[in-house]
């Protein structure tokens, strides 16, 4: 039979510049001598010879003189290969081929890695920064392998995904320099962190920059928004109210108005230096241009979608700045429930039936209540499931399993917790005339 050759299942991870051992072993039979051994290491794909042992002698490295066997351990079945000063180009699969009387082979993977340097951060522009200014933050980390994953987040740890451009360039040694650029509109204060992750080493290198824009001696602008969330029906338009008090002599040329998503800092709409810069949010937003000069910075959001739900920050900068966040709560009414009964014929008292109540295209998730004809809640044996469609609207299906009495009315109430809207349906089940004793 074939000779059994063992190698590790998982790739061998080696840092660039260090030595790596590609383990390989076989089980020598009693009386085995090295004169009988043929050992060949080769690159799996190209079959290029790496190292060999034949006719009792180490034939040496055929791989840039950077490989060695463990001669003292060969007789015990240790055919491992030492690879010195690992390079990126060494990454790949190596086959260990052992022949005595029979032969066998197995392949081991070498995964090369190099840690990324602590990122350096640059800010452009880096002086005379004001709220509302757009800045470019560059995060650079060097000499890593393999390609990095780069993550940006704000001071609260919230991921920043919009307006990020990441490029990775390999040098002559195959190591990567990574440059990631975040373009962001400045708020009052901001900490921006860049995390460079080596996916193989699971090593994170991070740096952050805190930007404090210049303040005016004349003091902050007071910005007012409603305390309660703005509730908007899906498909309708919503107004996110925001106002400030303009000083005498105020002109729109002095105004920087920015609406952005509070969490991600994604730009929604802006007005700068006397001009509406337009919607950066799927062209569904508008300001009230005729009212801006009076301090009305409200935002109109058209054709509201479920995905719009969340907090929007209204950021006003004149000489100085102020900001406030308003919450948008999206809602959609649930349809009148449809009721199905299974089984739905030849029903007798004592039969178990399943009543399904279905209501469609509501938001947010519904509360479902069952009750009998006397208004007594039915809580046992109820299973409710809610599934969101592509638009994020929920279809709700609630199943009641009940044992029939003589007659019964079963009502299902689907409540939208935001709209405080109740949609209900009911079914009345009249059993067959009863005979005593009931027929089997």
């Amino acid at each position: 039979g074939a000779l059994e050759v063992q190698v590790p299942e998982d790739p061998v991870v080696a840092l660039v510049g260090t030595d790596a051992t590609l383990c390989c072993s076989f089980s020598p039979e009693p009386g085995f001598s090295l004169a009988q051994l043929n050992l060949i290491w080769q690159l799996t794909d190209t079959k290029q010879l790496v190292h060999s042992f034949a006719e009792g002698q180490d034939q040496g490295s055929a791989y840039a003189n950077r490989t060695a066997l463990f001669p003292d351990l060969l007789a015990q079945g240790n055919a491992s290969l030492r690879l010195q000063r690992v390079r990126v180009a060494d990454e790949g699969s190596f086959t260990c081929f052992v022949s005595i009387r029979d032969f066998g082979s197995a392949a081991v993977s070498l995964q090369v890695a190099a840690p990324y340097s602590k990122p350096s951060m640059t800010l452009e522009p880096n002086k005379d920064l004001r709220p509302g200014d757009t800045v470019t933050i560059t995060c650079s980390s060097y000499q890593g392998y393999p390609e990095a994953e780069v993550f940006w987040q704000d001071g609260q740890g919230v991921p920043l995904t919009g307006n990020v451009t990441t490029s990775q360039m390999a040098n002559e040694q195959g190591l990567f320099d990574v440059h990631s650029i975040l373009r962001v509109v400045l708020g009052a204060n901001g900490t921006y962190s860049c995390l460079v992750r080596n996916p193989v080493l699971q090593q994170d290198a991070h740096s952050s920059v805190t930007i404090t824009p210049q303040r005016s001696p004349t003091g902050a602008v007071e910005v007012q928004v409603p305390e309660d969330p703005v509730v908007a029906l899906v498909g309708t338009d919503a107004t996110l109210r925001c106002s400030f008090s303009p000083e005498p002599g105020f002109s729109l040329a002095q105004l920087n108005l920015i609406w952005q998503l509070t969490d991600t800092k994604q730009l929604v709409h802006s007005f700068t230096e006397g001009r509406d810069q337009g919607s950066a949010y799927a062209n569904r937003t508008a300001l009230f241009p005729d009212l801006l000069a009076q301090g009305n910075a409200s935002l109109r959001l058209q054709r509201v979608r479920v995905a719009d739900e969340g907090s929007f920050t209204c950021f006003v900068s004149i000489r100085d700045f102020g900001s406030a966040a308003v919450s948008l709560q999206v809602a959609a009414p649930y349809s009148k429930p449809s009721m199905t009964l299974e089984p739905n014929k030849d029903l007798r008292p004592g039969d178990t039936v399943t009543i399904t109540c279905s209501s469609y295209r509501g938001y947010p998730e519904a509360e479902v209540f069952w009750q009998d004809g006397q208004g007594v809640p039915l809580t046992g044996n109820v299973t409710t499931s809610q599934m969101a469609n592509e638009q994020g609207l929920f279809d709700v299906h609630s199943v009641l399993r009940v044992v029939l009495g003589a007659n019964g009315t079963y009502s299902c109430l689907v409540r939208n917790p935001v709209l405080q809207q109740d949609a209900h349906g009911s079914v009345t089940i009249t059993g067959q005339p009863m005979t005593f004793p009931p027929e089997a």
Partner: antibody, heavy 116, light 107 residues
Amino acid sequence: QVQLQQPGAELVRPGASVKLSCKASGYTFTAYWMNWVKQRPDQGLEWIGRIDPYDSETRYNQNFRDKARLTVDKSSSTAYMQLSSLTSEDSAVFYCARGVRIFDYWGQGTTLTVSS
Amino acid sequence: DIQMTQSPASLAASVGETVTITCRTSENIDYTLAWYQQKPGKSPQLLIYNANTLEDGVPSRFSGSGSGTHFSLKINSMQPEDTATYFCKQAYDVPRTFGGGTKLEIK
């Protein structure tokens, strides 16, 4: 180091157009607005307009709206200003300068001579 | 547009003398004023921004002050290399506007 390179001189005929260039290096081109400023001999400085290289958004001085057109080529980190329907009044030194409120780096200027 | 009035249009000063140039604006521009120096045959160079912040590498004999509509540039101890034309510029509004310039010469 930051550099804004402009050709030294351009000679053009009246009525013609000219496209002045400003090649940026030593910084992230898309991070700063690029401004253009006109200076006539022994006269003051006039702001023509500016362009955001990131998305090519422009702002113009109304006095130059029909005279100048600003563009950029991000791949070569170069800003351009096209001046049309040239007259002797357009003979001047034209500078590019980066920044929003402060112009911290300026090109050496291109001397435009409009003459037949 | 915001009008910028700079004075004097020209002056001559001796080495070591203190020089003051003023700039007035037609409306309140808070503190968004910059000063530039232009030597003959050269492009302008930023000296001061935000009315009083000295640009990196600018000698400390230069200083700026003012806010609202009245601003000044002061050169403590005039040096021969300070021979140049000085411009103020407002950054409060678009279009950006410059003062007419002050030509400073050595006496």
